[in-house]
């Protein structure tokens, strides 16, 4: 004969545990029903009556099957440097993440507690490592033969143009200037235009996130900004 299915509340067999989505109530000494996500225990079970569940009130939630007397409060509204990536509902907490051009300087269990603006690399410096959601850009000086003339959280150093005759030699913050004969550029033909990354940062100046122009393939002087360090080396 099949074993009889016990309905909550019921006394468990000695040494056995309550079933999935049930909990053992110490007072009643019975296995009782848990409340579903989005609800909480309004009345705890007794030996003769099961748990009475009620929906969470506005701005409160429960994410798991539970028997808590009150739902949890949703986190405070996202700050101006954040975007709400998950709204507060009866079943889930609000999640705030940093907006583009910022990174999470202090994280919490889900989302971010404190966002900080991505550092910008000054001219003569490029993005050695792009920022990620949780880490800042690392700026380093341009290596010999490369330059960056921008203040940016995304631009890398790029090679000086190669001149037949140099009018002004390039340095870390300025491209070489050629005499009237057209220069050759150390860029492969059909070079891809790099899209603006979602979030990256750079050196020594107060950041104000700004779009960064992709590298120009028409090599007229003066040169535009360095190509951005597109994407982010994520954690």
């Amino acid at each position: 004969l099949p074993a009889q299915v016990a309905f909550t509340p019921y006394a468990p067999e000695p040494g056995s545990t309550c079933r999935l989505r049930e909990y053992y109530d110490q007072t009643a000494q019975m296995c009782c029903s848990k409340c579903s996500p989005g609800q909480h225990a309004k009345v705890f079970c007794t030996k003769t009556s099961d748990t009475v569940c009620d929906s969470c009130e506005d701005s409160t939630y429960t994410q798991l099957w539970n028997w808590v007397p009150e739902c949890l409060s949703c986190g405070s509204r996202c700050s101006s440097d954040q975007v709400e990536t998950q709204a507060c509902t009866r079943e889930q907490n609000r999640i705030c993440t940093c907006r583009p051009g910022w990174y999470c300087a202090l994280s919490k269990q889900e989302g971010c507690r404190l966002c900080a603006p991505l550092r910008k690399c000054r001219p003569g410096f490029g993005v050695a490592r792009p920022g990620t959601e949780t880490s800042d850009v690392v700026c380093k000086p341009c290596a010999p033969g490369t330059f960056s003339n921008t203040t940016s959280s995304t631009d890398i150093c790029r090679p000086h143009q190669i001149c037949n005759v140099v009018a002004i030699p390039g340095n870390a913050s300025m491209d070489a200037v050629c005499t009237s004969t057209s220069p050759t550029r150390s860029m492969a033909p059909g070079a891809v235009h790099l899209p603006q990354p979602v979030s990256t940062r750079s050196q020594h100046t107060q950041p104000t996130p700004e779009p960064s122009t992709a590298p120009s393939t028409s090599f007229l002087l003066p040169m535009g900004p360095s190509p951005p360090a597109e994407g982010s080396t994520g954690d």
């Epitope: 690399c121 490029g126 050695a128 690392v138 700026c139 860029m187 360090a229 597109e230 080396t233 954690d235």
Partner: antibody, heavy 118, light 107 residues
Framework: EVQLQQSGPELRRPGSSVKLSCKAS????????LHWVKHSPEHGLEWIGW????????KYGQKFQSKATLTADTSSNAAYMQLSSLTSEDSATYFC???????????WGQGASVTVSS | DIVMTQSPTSMSISVGDRVTLNCKAS??????VDWYQQKTGQSPKVLLY???IRYTGVPDRFTGSGSGTEFTFTITNMQAEDLAVYFC?????????FGSGTKLEIK
């Protein structure tokens, strides 16, 4: 350009540790991030991590988090990698590489061979 | 981890040939791919960064293209001194990962 000079080959017993050095000349190591890369016939090139000698900040690949420790000494213009609890799996050639504002590994050391054998 | 699948593994070529190598990323890496050359007994040397930017001092016979998941590295007019192993590397996300390399040999 920066040149990176690595320490010589090392032979170690299983369970011991080894410290490799990478000395920069021509430029200050603070001008670069310094990466370490493992090269073995079985796994090819594997990124271990980087250190920013300017502030000592490090970033490790998860696989090497408990294996490698990266340090730098600005006074000697050198970076170091210590490998602990060595096993035969750690037998490989290890490269250091300098990363400037180009975002790439501009210059590499000549490599240091580590052999772990009993 | 992002897997960089490089093809072919090896290639026999003649001086003057046009050589094309491919690198395929297991997920979108934008343009965050570098190409390196490693000659026998030497350390690697960067040739191209950000998929297509030729590093300073690198001859213009080396070119690169691609973005997203498909990348191409080309040597036009192969020279004897170009015999080496070439590998790609992605730095879009940690851990940084490398292709297994392509060995160029003389036919």
């Amino acid at each position: 350009e920066v040149q990176l000079q690595q320490s010589g080959p090392e032979l170690r017993r299983p369970g011991s540790s080894v410290k490799l050095s990478c000395k920069a000349s021509g430029y200050s190591i603070t001008d670069y991030l310094l990466h370490w890369v493992k090269h073995s016939p079985e796994h090819g090139l594997e990124w271990i991590g980087w250190i920013d000698p300017e502030d000592g900040k490090t970033k490790y690949g998860q696989k090497f988090q408990s294996k490698a420790t990266l340090t730098a000494d600005t006074s000697s213009n050198a970076a170091y990698m210590q490998l602990s609890s060595l096993t035969s799996e750690d037998s490989a050639t290890y490269f250091c590489a300098a990363n400037s504002g180009t975002g790439t590994m501009d210059a590499w050391g000549q490599g240091a061979s580590v052999t772990v054998s009993s | 981890d992002i897997v960089m699948t490089q093809s072919p593994t090896s290639m026999s070529i003649s001086v003057g040939d046009r050589v094309t190598l491919n690198c395929k990323a297991s997920q979108n890496v934008g343009s965050n791919v570098d190409w390196y050359q490693q000659k026998t007994g030497q350390s690697p040397k960067v040739l191209l960064y950000k998929a297509s930017i030729r590093y300073t001092g690198v001859p213009d016979r080396f070119t690169g293209s691609g973005s997203g998941t498909e990348f191409t590295f080309t040597i036009t007019n192969m020279q004897a001194e170009d015999l080496a192993v070439y590998f790609c590397m992605q730095s879009k996300s940690y851990p940084i990962t490398f292709g297994s390399g392509t060995k160029l040999e003389i036919k």
